[in-house]
Amino acid sequence: CDLPQTHSLGNRRALILLAQMRRISPFSCLKDRHDFEFPQEEFDDKQFQKAQAISVLHEMIQQTFNLFSTKDSSAALDETLLDEFYIELDQQLNDLESCVMQEVGVIESPLMYEDSILAVRKYFQRITLYLTEKKYSSCAWEVVRAEIMRSFSLSINLQKRLKSKE
């Protein structure tokens, strides 16, 4: 499956939007940092099958969409930027979904990748729990925003590796 050229441009735009969502200087939030235990192994493509990678990427973007579409995120972040961000993520999801459809005939059911998808979901649960514990403070949002930028950039790298394997 060939992801369209617009897909990587969309990734870049999503990262820029995330960067623009900053509401407080991270220099002021150093004490609030937290290790969310990003599931790095799910993004290392040593034995990765393409369909598995696409499923993991899809889950990553879906969970990012869920995280940023809560009423708490709307209250804490710029709504115009959020709306643009949703559009980019929605496009990413559509691109990946059409890829999954093409790959399904080649490889067995995505149930094979349940562990990988579960690891991504648990990662986002840890992020949500952190925000709740920190009462959705501006520094907590800054920590989460920076974390999502980092994980998003790692998932972009995986997509680049997939493309180079084609």
Partner: antibody, heavy 121, light 107 residues
Framework: QVQLVQSGAEVKKPGSSVKVSCKAS????????ISWVRQAPGQGLEWMGG????????NYAQKFQGRVTITADESTSTAYMELSSLRSEDTAVYYC??????????????WGQGTLVTVSS | DIQMTQSPSSLSASVGDRVTITCRAS??????LNWYQQKPGKAPKLLIY???SLQSGVPSRFSGSGSGTDFTLTISSLQPEDFATYYC?????????FGQGTKVEIK
């Protein structure tokens, strides 16, 4: 690869100001933090403050508050540090240092070559 | 502000020696400690971050340990290019602060 190129050495009179530039290449300029660190002759390292270009607002060490201004120009990928009301004890090598992209600004991953500022009457 | 105190301020050692430098923070900084190497006339270079993580491209003879207030940088077998000044730096909170440095000289 990542490179930070600073402006040349300066000799200034006490009471005047100096503005040092730091041109960055490699990575997305707007999305990482740049700090300024100084080192007086034979002395240790001292963090003055830092900025994230896309955010715009700088953070300063209390010691330099009111005397230092850190800015960034995204169009030229250049950061600036201006220090006013110079005194002899401001004689030092001034470094710009870049923090890792998408990370919290906690470690100095890349450094400029340094700019010697001499304050003398 | 968090004060960082390094010891010793200087030491003499020979090639092949095991060298240990310590850094103490005035309050707990978890594992938010970095180590740098600086040679005369050059900018500092990051060696270790988050107390014990080796920066990419740094030889494995360098290692870091500790958490809370007490930290250690160890060079397992000193090489000629390791003669330099070493600084610790806390990144727990702003202002980011450095130790006063430890100069490693040839015996």
């Amino acid at each position: 690869q990542v490179q930070l190129v600073q402006s040349g050495a300066e000799v200034k009179k006490p009471g005047s100001s100096v503005k040092v530039s730091c041109k960055a290449s490699g990575g997305t300029f707007s999305s990482y933090a740049i700090s300024w660190v100084r080192q007086a002759p034979g002395q240790g390292l001292e963090w003055m403050g830092g900025i994230i270009p896309i955010f715009g607002t700088a953070n300063y060490a209390q010691k330099f508050q009111g005397r230092v201004t850190i800015t960034a120009d995204e169009s030229t990928s250049t950061a600036y540090m201006e220090l006013s009301s110079l005194r002899s004890e401001d004689t030092a090598v001034y470094y710009c240092a870049r923090h890792l992209e998408y990370a919290f600004p906690d470690k100095f991953d890349y450094w400029g070559q340094g700019t010697l500022v001499t304050v003398s009457s | 502000d968090i004060q960082m105190t390094q010891s010793p301020s200087s030491l003499s050692a020979s090639v092949g020696d095991r060298v240990t430098i310590t850094c103490r923070a005035s309050q707990s900084i978890s594992s938010y400690l970095n180590w740098y190497q600086q040679k005369p006339g050059k900018a500092p270079k990051l060696l270790i971050y988050f107390a014990s993580s080796l920066q990419s491209g740094v030889p494995s003879r360098f290692s870091g340990s500790g958490s809370g207030t007490d930290f250690t940088l160890t060079i397992s077998s000193l090489q000629p290019e390791d003669f330099a000044t070493y600084y610790c730096q806390q990144s727990y909170s702003t202002p980011l602060t450095f130790g006063q440095g430890t100069k490693v000289e040839i015996k």
